[in-house]
C-alpha cells in the first residue's frame, strides 16, 4: 500500500527526518512547514497548527526557505564608488559592486565591502597586469625601446618609433623624435608590449642600458659621436 502523505504538523517516525521545506520544531516536537523566500515565521507551529508565515517588510529579505522570526535587513545603500547590481527585494539582498575604474579591495559574501580606485601607472611605467574586479593594476617600468608618457590604469608601454635619423632619443617616458617627416616604421600594430624580461639584456651581470639610450633608436643614429645620454632617466 502507498504510504499516506502526512500533512504538517506531524510527528516524524522515530529516526527519520522531516521532508524538504519542513523543519523539526523542538517545542512542538513536530515536523512543520518552512516559510518560502520573501517570508518569515510570524507564528511558530504547535502540535495542532502549522507555521504561520508573513511577507518580509520593506528593506528586509529572506533568500531561502526558513523559519526565522524576522527577515534579514538589506545592506546599506551602495556608496558613491559602487553601483547597485542587485536591488533589495523581499527575496534577495542588495548587491553593490565597484564602479568602472575601481576594484574590490575587501569583499564580502556577496558584492563588495570596500572599493578602491585602480592604480594608475605614471609616465615611464606601463600596465603589466590589468586590474580585475578583485585585484589592482600592477605597473612595471618600461623596458628599453618602449615608453609610456601617460598616467593611466590601462596604458601599456609602447615601442619607440624607429627613425631614419633621430633628433631626440626616446626614453622610458618619451617617444623618440625623428628629424625626418615620418619614422621609417613602428612596431607592428597590435603587438603586445607589456613589460617583460628581455633575454638579450645584461643587467644581471653588468649595469643596465638606460631607457634613454634604447637600442630601437640609438643604433640608427647617424655616424659620428652619439649625443650624451640623459643621466638617471629611470622613468
Amino acid at each position: 500500500l502507498p504510504a499516506q502523505v502526512a500533512f504538517t504538523p506531524y510527528a516524524p517516525e522515530p529516526g527519520s527526518t522531516c521532508r524538504l521545506r519542513e523543519y523539526y520544531d523542538q517545542t512542538a516536537q513536530m515536523c512543520c512547514s518552512k516559510c518560502s523566500p520573501g517570508q518569515h515565521a510570524k507564528v511558530f507551529c504547535t502540535k495542532t497548527s502549522d507555521t504561520v508565515c508573513d511577507s518580509c517588510e520593506d528593506s528586509t529579505y529572506t533568500q531561502l526557505w526558513n523559519w526565522v522570526p524576522e527577515c534579514l535587513s538589506c545592506g546599506s545603500r551602495c556608496s558613491s564608488d559602487q553601483v547597485e547590481t542587485q536591488a533589495c527585494t523581499r527575496e534577495q539582498n542588495r548587491i553593490c559592486t565597484c564602479r568602472p575604474g575601481w576594484y574590490c579591495a575587501l569583499s564580502k559574501q556577496e558584492g563588495c565591502r570596500l572599493c578602491a580606485p585602480l592604480r594608475k601607472c605614471r609616465p615611464g611605467f606601463g600596465v603589466a597586469r590589468p586590474g580585475t574586479e578583485t585585484s589592482d593594476v600592477v605597473c612595471k617600468p618600461c623596458a628599453p625601446g618602449t615608453f609610456s608618457n601617460t598616467t593611466s590604469s590601462t596604458d601599456i608601454c609602447r615601442p619607440h618609433q624607429i627613425c631614419n635619423v633621430v633628433a631626440i632619443p626616446g626614453n622610458a617616458s618619451m617617444d623618440a623624435v625623428c628629424t625626418s617627416t615620418s619614422p621609417t616604421r613602428s612596431m607592428a600594430p597590435g603587438a603586445v608590449h607589456l613589460p617583460q624580461p628581455v633575454s638579450t639584456r645584461s643587467q644581471h651581470t653588468q649595469p643596465t642600458p638606460e631607457p634613454s639610450t634604447a637600442p630601437s633608436t640609438s643604433f640608427l643614429l647617424p655616424m659620428g659621436p652619439s649625443p650624451p645620454a640623459e643621466g638617471s632617466t629611470g622613468d
Partner: antibody, heavy 119, light 106 residues
Framework: QVQLVQSGAEVKKPGASVKVSCKAS????????IHWVRQAPGQGLEWMGW????????DYADKFKKRVTMTADTSISTAFMELSRLRSDDTAVYYC????????????WGQGTLVTVSS | DIQMTQSPSSLSASVGDRVTITCQGS??????LAWFQQKPGKAPKLLIY???SLQTGVPSRFSGSRSGTDFTLTISSLQPEDFATYFC????????FGGGTKLELK
C-alpha cells in the same frame, strides 16, 4: 603590515665590496620596484637606482653605474644592493624603498644600513 | 639631469607658526614631486606625493602646492613633532632629491 627589513651595519676597507639586503613582507614583492637611496653623514638623500624584482630589470644613476649591482631573490622576497671598489666617501646609511609605479612613490622604507668605509 | 633647488636650507620657527618650504625644478616635472620628512636616525617618511596628495595617516596641516616649476610644502600650524628635515623629490624624469631643509625650534 608592509615592512622592509635591512641587514646590519658593515665596516669595510677601501677597495672592498659591500652587499646590503632588504627583506620585504606584507605585500606582493614582485608587484613593486625597489629603490636604493643613500645618505652620507649630515648630508642629503641620493638616489642610486632601482630593481624590478619580477624581471631583474634595473636602472642605475650615472654616478654608480660602474660600481653598483642590484639583484633580487623572489623566493625569499629580498632585494640586494652591492657596491664595489668602496671609497671613504661611500660611508653612508643605505636605504631601500618600494615603489608601485603610480603617482604614489616610495611609500615604505627600510630602517637603513650604515656602511662605514675606513682603512 | 633635472636639478631640484630646495630653499631655505635651514629654518627656525615656533610651535603654531605657518611654515613654507620651496623646491624649484630646473625643467618641467609635471606634478611628479613628493615631500619626505626625516628625523635623526630614522628613515625618510612620505608626506605628500604627486604635488598635492596627502599620504594616508599624514596630518592635514601638511599640504603641497605648485606654481609652474616651483613647488611648496606648507605646514599650517607647526607642532612639536614637526621639527625635522624635509626633502623634495622629483620622479618625472629620472629621480632627484632636493638638498633638504632643516626645520629647527626657534
Amino acid at each position: 603590515q608592509v615592512q622592509l627589513v635591512q641587514s646590519g651595519a658593515e665596516v669595510k676597507k677601501p677597495g672592498a665590496s659591500v652587499k646590503v639586503s632588504c627583506k620585504a613582507s606584507g605585500y606582493t614583492f614582485t608587484d613593486y620596484i625597489i629603490h636604493w637611496v643613500r645618505q652620507a653623514p649630515g648630508q642629503g638623500l641620493e638616489w642610486m637606482g632601482w630593481i624590478d624584482p619580477d624581471y631583474g630589470n634595473t636602472d642605475y644613476a650615472d654616478k654608480f653605474k660602474k660600481r653598483v649591482t642590484m639583484t633580487a631573490d623572489t623566493s625569499i622576497s629580498t632585494a640586494f644592493m652591492e657596491l664595489s671598489r668602496l671609497r671613504s666617501d661611500d660611508t653612508a646609511v643605505y636605504y631601500c624603498a618600494r615603489d608601485e609605479g603610480s603617482p604614489l612613490v616610495m611609500d615604505a622604507w627600510g630602517q637603513g644600513t650604515l656602511v662605514t668605509v675606513s682603512s | 639631469d633635472i636639478q631640484m633647488t630646495q630653499s631655505p636650507s635651514s629654518l627656525s620657527a615656533s610651535v603654531g607658526d605657518r611654515v613654507t618650504i620651496t623646491c624649484q625644478g630646473s625643467q618641467n616635472i609635471d606634478n611628479y614631486l613628493a615631500w619626505f620628512q626625516q628625523k635623526p636616525g630614522k628613515a625618510p617618511k612620505l608626506l605628500i606625493y604627486s604635488t598635492y596628495s596627502l599620504q594616508t595617516g599624514v596630518p592635514s596641516r601638511f599640504s603641497g602646492s605648485r606654481s609652474g616649476t616651483d613647488f611648496t610644502l606648507t605646514i599650517s600650524s607647526l607642532q612639536p613633532e614637526d621639527f625635522a628635515t624635509y626633502f623634495c623629490f622629483q620622479y618625472n624624469n629620472g629621480y632627484m632629491f632636493g638638498g633638504g631643509t632643516k626645520l629647527e625650534l626657534k
